[in-house]
């Protein structure tokens, strides 16, 4: 004899008007806008012996649905009308003919928040089971893409950046990728849930923001996750850093995909200007400044890169008169102070005048 | 919790009719098969018929083919018996009785088991000239 | 039409006896078979379906066995309660049917 599932009388909440008619859902479920939730559902009815081999059907229903006039949210009858605005987001999973009446709500929305109950048609069987129902919340969407930076961001060196959304479903419409950054960048392979920005940072992008943008289409909703870029020159071992953005600058809403497109004579100017300045600096502090550059973790760190709640931007004061740059060899005491204080742009701003050309490009 | 209540017993002679009625109260009526079984004095159980409430279809034991029109009345929640061309061997208490299919295995292959769960309190029909 | 064939028609026991009666279908009805009882003057009570399980609100003193043919009721200890009529009914095929009953009475 097969086994008997008589238990189910007992589960609390499972009993509908007809104690032989009963259903076990879970009475609440919370799901954040854009996202998806799978709702288990089981449920039980009679067969009277003239229905015994009609096909099952099975319907949710919007709370106070008539259901001679108003159109299911979801159903397993091919030919049923359903409700416009679920359409292709609500979907009845489970198979009734196994008892199984389980929900699937996709790309959630603001509006269907509600309570929902399902029906059993069988035949001439046919059954609403009014309690318990399922109450659907749908709440703002908390999650966060994250960016994952493989290593260290070196001037003129490639790095593939990961934006990803591991929280996202499936089942769902697939997001909409959008980046933005003044650095100078192309776009990667993408897969359901993550898109990859080719970056080549320069030094003047240092400090600069970097912006993924997530669009969940099918709810109308955005999400996105900035970093500042810590470019720095470091010939140690890299490491990889995720940067999740707590305290990593505020959040900016953008676009899409920016390339920063700078002229050659601006590059070119900016690089002399940098030689100049590190120059100076060697001149003037000598070792005492590299040495307390290596000690200071918090502001200059001379290995590794920074993470960006340590991050602060450090201005270089020079003197007001033009030092002299005439590109002449540098000494040996220079290499010597320039091993000190390592090649690193923690301080260095983009220019004021460098003009930064945006541009658009989008991943979907 | 569902019940069957059924009307009062009847007196017929041979040849008439007798139309039971079976009124189901506080459960769910149109989804069970309502049976009909009846009982001669003294003797054992016989089943006659069923009516499926929601379409009004039938099917009885060939014994009774001809004679027997079981209906409902969905308004109200009542089903009748009639049996026609009584004969003095018609006396018997007729009931009816709810038939459900009380369990179910999970699975591709579900398996349903039916009893009459659920009784009349039964009619008395005498038929005698 | 299946045939159902109990034994013995009537029983005489005590209380507190354990007690047996026996049901035999004509062909196989794999396990679809119940169980009533029925006392004078009452419309008849579902006792077991599926040949084995216990309708709800039945004292677990009524046990019932058996698969295809033949079929057993037991009452493990009688209660003053139990002394009634008792039908096996096959509910594998149409019409249903009744076994002609066992009559349990007081010794």
């Known amino acids: 004899m097969p086994l008997l599932l008589l238990l189910p009388l007992l589960w609390a909440g499972a009993l509908a008007m007809d104690p032989n008619f009963w259903l076990q859902v879970q009475e609440s479920v919370t799901v954040q806008e854009g996202l998806c939730v799978l709702v288990p559902c089981t449920f039980f009815h009679p067969i009277p012996y003239y229905d015994k081999n009609s096909p099952v059907h099975g319907y949710w229903f919007r709370e106070g649905a008539i259901i001679s006039r108003d159109s299911p949210v979801a159903t397993n009858k091919l030919d049923q009308e359903v409700q416009e605005e679920t359409q292709g987001r609500f979907r009845l999973l489970g198979d009734p003919s196994r008892n199984n009446c389980s929900l699937s709500i996709v790309d959630a929305r603001r509006r269907d928040n509600g309570s929902y109950f399902f029906r059993m048609e069988r035949g001439s069987t046919k059954y609403s089971y009014k309690s318990p129902q399922l109450s659907v919340h749908v709440t703002d969407l908390t999650h966060r893409p994250k960016i994952l930076i493989p290593g260290t961001l070196e001037p003129g060196h490639s790095k593939n950046l990961t934006c990803s959304v591991s929280w996202a479903c499936e089942q769902g419409t697939p997001p909409i990728f959008s980046w933005l950054s003044a650095a100078p960048t192309s776009l990667g392979p993408r897969t359901t849930h993550s898109s990859v920005l080719i970056i080549t940072p320069r030094p003047q992008d240092h400090g600069t923001n970097l912006t993924c943008q997530v669009k969940f289409a099918g709810a109308g909703v955005t999400t996105e996750r900035t970093i500042q870029l810590n470019v720095t020159y470091v010939p140690q071992n890299p490491t990889t850093g995720i940067f999740p953005g707590d305290g990593s600058g505020k959040q900016e809403t953008r676009a899409g995909v920016v390339h920063g497109a700078i002229g050659g004579a601006g590059v070119t100017a900016l690089l002399a200007l940098c030689l100049c300045l590190i120059f100076f600096i060697v001149k003037t502090h000598r070792r005492k400044a590299a040495r307390t550059a290596v000690g200071r973790n918090d502001t200059h760190p001379t290995t590794g890169s920074a993470s960006p709640k340590h991050q602060k931007k450090s201005k270089l004061h020079g003197p007001t008169e033009t030092s002299s740059c005439s590109g002449a060899a540098p000494t040996v005491e220079m290499d010597e102070e320039l091993h000190y204080a390592s090649l690193n742009f923690h301080g260095m701003n983009p220019s004021k005048d460098t003009s930064t050309e945006y541009s658009e490009v989008r991943t979907q | 919790q569902v019940q069957l209540v059924q009307s009062g017993a009847e007196v017929k002679k041979p040849g008439a009719s007798v139309k039971v009625s079976c009124k189901a109260s506080g459960g769910t009526f149109s989804n069970y098969a309502i049976n009909w079984v009846r009982q001669a004095p003294g003797q054992g159980l016989e089943w006659m018929g069923w009516i499926n409430p929601n379409s009004g279809g039938t099917d009885s034991a060939q014994k009774f083919q001809g004679r027997v029109t079981m209906t409902r009345d969905t308004s109200t929640s009542t089903v009748y018996m009639e049996l026609s061309s009584l004969r003095s061997e018609d006396t018997a208490v007729y009931y009816c009785a709810r038939d459900s299919s009380l369990a179910l295995s999970y699975g591709g292959n579900s398996e349903y088991y039916y009893g009459m769960d659920v009784w009349g309190q039964g009619t008395t029909v005498t038929v005698s000239s | 039409d299946i045939q159902m064939t109990q034994s013995p028609s009537s029983l005489s026991a005590s209380v507190g006896d354990r007690v047996t009666i026996t049901c035999q279908a004509s062909q196989d009805i794999s396990d679809h078979l119940n169980w009533y009882q029925q006392k004078p003057g009452k419309a008849p009570k579902l006792l077991i379906y599926g040949a084995s399980t216990l309708q709800s609100g039945v004292p677990s003193r009524f046990s019932g066995s058996g698969s295809g043919t033949d079929f057993t009721l037991t009452i493990s200890s009688l209660q003053p309660e139990d002394f009634a009529t008792y039908y096996c009914?096959?509910?594998?095929?149409?019409?249903?049917?009744f076994g002609q009953g066992t009559k349990l009475e007081i010794k």
């Open positions: 009914q096959q509910a594998y095929s149409f019409p249903w049917t």
